[in-house]
Interface confidence: low
C-alpha cells in the first residue's frame, strides 16, 4: 500500500470488470488499476467483491470484508484470462443478485458499484446494461463507470448514475494509474467524526457529521443521518443542512445516561446505510454544565 | 425443442424431506438458470429459487433454510431437496427455465403434484 | 418482498370481447414485469415479458402496457382457448413474486 489518500466509509463497494476478449493485452493495466484502488478503501466495515464479465458474468470474489480473503481475490483477478463477448449486463446481474441477498436481514449496507469497460455496447448489449444496472440501482447502488478506449460516453453515462459518475480514459490503459485519485475522491462516502461527540441525557442537541462525499447523493434532499441505539433501534434524522464534507443534523433525545448512538448516513431515504465506527455517548449534565 | 420433465415421489411424510429432479433436453443446464416454482391448491404461483449456468444457487427467503438445489451436468439435472416438510409445502412443484439477459420464465416443466401427509 | 396485486379477481367476458386485466407492484419495479397464461392442469405458459415485449408464437391479440407499477394485459378479441387463468411476475427484484391471478370465464 503506498499511503496516499484513502477512504474510511464503511459500505459494499462491487468492481465490475470487464475481460472480454478486446482487453485481452490490457489485463495487467486493469489488475494493476484494481489493486491500487482496493487497497485504498481501508474501514473494517467495508466489505468488497470482484465480479468479471465477458460472454457470462463470473462472481470471482463475493462480498467480504475479510483482508486475507481480498488479497486472495486479488491474486484470483491477476489470473484471469480475458477472451469473449462484453456482456456487461451480466456484471450487473451478479452484483444485484448479492445487494439484494446479502442485505435481506432488513438492514441494507450501502452499495458502490465500480463498473470498467473498454469499447462500444451494440444496441441489444446496452439495452441489457442499462437495464441491469438500473435493477442495481433500484436496489440502493450508486454506479460508476470507467470506461477505457473505444467507449461511447453517452452510453456510459445512462449506465452509470449521470455523466459525473463516468470517469473517461481517452489515453489507453496504461492512463488508469492516473484517475485512481478522482475515483477515489468521487466514490467514497465517509464518516470521520462526529462534533459534539457527547451529548447531555435528556437534551437536544446538534450534531456536525465531519466526513466526505456527501454530495455524492443523486438526489441530496435524500441524505440521512441515522442513529443506531444501543444497536437497537434505529433512529433516522433528515439534516438542516448537507455539504459535501459535513452534514448538520438534528441528534435524538437520549434519556438515559450511557446511551450509545452508532452514526450511520444513508444517501437514499433509508434504502440502505454507510456506517462508520463514530459513536455518540450520552453523559449526565449538571444545571451549570 | 427445450424441454423439462419432474420426477420424484409423489406423497411424502410430515418433517421427512421432499426430493425431485428436473431432467432437461434440448440446452445444457451449463447455460442459464434453472428453477423450481410451486403452486400450493388455489394459491398463487410461488418461486422457491434458481441454480445457475455457474452452479451458484439463490433461494427465496421465505423458505429460510430447508431447501437446497443441486445439478449433476453429466446427467443435465437439477434437483430440489425441502426438509421439514409440513401440510402447507402440498403443491404442484414445476422446474422452469430463465434466459440469462431476462428474469422470465420461459421454459416449464409440466409439473408434478407432491401431497405431505401422513 | 414485492407484492403483486391482481384485478379482478374473475373477470366474465364473452367470445369476441376485449378483455382487460391489471395487475400492481408494491413498489417501483420499472417494466420488470411479466404475464403467463395458465390453463386446468397445465404449466403456466409466457404471453408477454417487459410489460410489453411480445413472444413469437403468441397471438397479436395479446398485449401489455404499464410501467412502474401498474400494468395492463389486453385481449382484444378473445377466442374459446382464451379462457383461462392469467398470473402477472415481478422480475425486477428476489424473491420473483407471482400475483394472485386474473380467471378469464366465459359470460
Known amino acids: 500500500e503506498d499511503g496516499g489518500p484513502a477512504c474510511y466509509g464503511g459500505f459494499d463497494l462491487y468492481f465490475i470488470l470487464d475481460k472480454s476478449g478486446s482487453v485481452l493485452h490490457h489485463w495487467n493495466e486493469i489488475y494493476y488499476f484494481v489493486e491500487q484502488l482496493a487497497h485504498k478503501f481501508i474501514s473494517p466495515q467495508l466489505r468488497m467483491s470482484f465480479i468479471v464479465f465477458s460472454t457470462r458474468g463470473t462472481t470471482l470474489m463475493k462480498l467480504t470484508e475479510d483482508r486475507e480473503q481480498i488479497r486472495q481475490g486479488l491474486e484470483e483477478l491477476q489470473k484471469v484470462l480475458p477472451g469473449g463477448d462484453t456482456y456487461m449486463h451480466e456484471g450487473f446481474e451478479r452484483a444485484s443478485e448479492q445487494i439484494y441477498y446479502e442485505n435481506r436481514q432488513g438492514y441494507r449496507t450501502a452499495s458502490v458499484i465500480i463498473a470498467l469497460t473498454d469499447g462500444e455496447l451494440h444496441e441489444d448489449l446496452f439495452f441489457y446494461s442499462e437495464r441491469e444496472a438500473n435493477r442495481s440501482r433500484d436496489l440502493g447502488a450508486i454506479v460508476y463507470c470507467v470506461g477505457v478506449k473505444d467507449f461511447n460516453e453517452t452510453q456510459l453515462a445512462r449506465i452509470a448514475d449521470s455523466k459525473d459518475h463516468v470517469f473517461p480514459v481517452n489515453d489507453g490503459f496504461q492512463a488508469l494509474q492516473g484517475i485512481i485519485h478522482s475515483i477515489l475522491k468521487k466514490s467514497c462516502i465517509e464518516i470521520l467524526a462526529a462534533e459534539p461527540s457527547t451529548i447531555c441525557a435528556g437534551e437536544s442537541f446538534q450534531v456536525v457529521v465531519r466526513g466526505n462525499g456527501f454530495r455524492h447523493a443523486r438526489n441530496v434532499d435524500r441524505v440521512l443521518c441515522s442513529f443506531k441505539i444501543n444497536d437497537s433501534v434505529t433512529l433516522n434524522e433528515k439534516p438542516f443542512s448537507v455539504e459535501d464534507t459535513y452534514l448538520l443534523c438534528p441528534a435524538p433525545i437520549l434519556k438515559e445516561v450511557g446511551m450509545k448512538a452508532a452514526l450511520q448516513v444513508s444517501m437514499n431515504d433509508g434504502l440502505s446505510f454507510i456506517s462508520s465506527s463514530v459513536i455518540i455517548t450520552t453523559t449526565h449534565c449538571s444545571d451549570g454544565s | 425443442e427445450v424441454q423439462l420433465q419432474e420426477s420424484g415421489p409423489g406423497l411424502v411424510k410430515p418433517s421427512e424431506t421432499l426430493s425431485l429432479t428436473c431432467t432437461v433436453t434440448g440446452d445444457s443446464i451449463s447455460s442459464d438458470y434453472w428453477n423450481w416454482v410451486r403452486q400450493a391448491p388455489g394459491q398463487r404461483l410461488e418461486w422457491m429459487g434458481y441454480?445457475?449456468?455457474?452452479?451458484?444457487?439463490y433461494t427465496n427467503p421465505s423458505l429460510k433454510s430447508r431447501i437446497t438445489i443441486n445439478r449433476d451436468t453429466s446427467k443435465n439435472q437439477f434437483s430440489l431437496q425441502l426438509n421439514s416438510v409440513t401440510p402447507e409445502d402440498t403443491a404442484v412443484y414445476y422446474c422452469?427455465?430463465?434466459?440469462?439477459?431476462?428474469?422470465?420464465?420461459?421454459?416449464w416443466g409440466q409439473g408434478t403434484t407432491v401431497t405431505v401427509s401422513s | 418482498e414485492i407484492v403483486m396485486t391482481q384485478s379482478p379477481a374473475t373477470l366474465s367476458v364473452s367470445p369476441g370481447e376485449r378483455a382487460t386485466l391489471s395487475c400492481r407492484a408494491s413498489q417501483n419495479i420499472r417494466d420488470f414485469l411479466h404475464w403467463y397464461q395458465q390453463k386446468p392442469g397445465q404449466a403456466p405458459r409466457l404471453l408477454i415479458y417487459y410489460a410489453s415485449q411480445s413472444i413469437s408464437g403468441i397471438p397479436a391479440r395479446f398485449s401489455g402496457s404499464g410501467s412502474g407499477t401498474d400494468f395492463t394485459l389486453t385481449i382484444s378479441s378473445l377466442e374459446p382457448e382464451d379462457f383461462a387463468v392469467y398470473y402477472c411476475?415481478?422480475?425486477?427484484?428476489?424473491?420473483?413474486?407471482f400475483g394472485g391471478g386474473t380467471k378469464v370465464e366465459i359470460k
Open positions: 422452469a427455465r430463465y434466459k440469462t439477459i431476462t428474469s422470465m420464465f420461459d421454459v
Open positions: 411476475q415481478n422480475g425486477h427484484s428476489f424473491p420473483y413474486t
Open positions: 441454480i445457475s449456468y455457474s452452479g451458484n444457487t
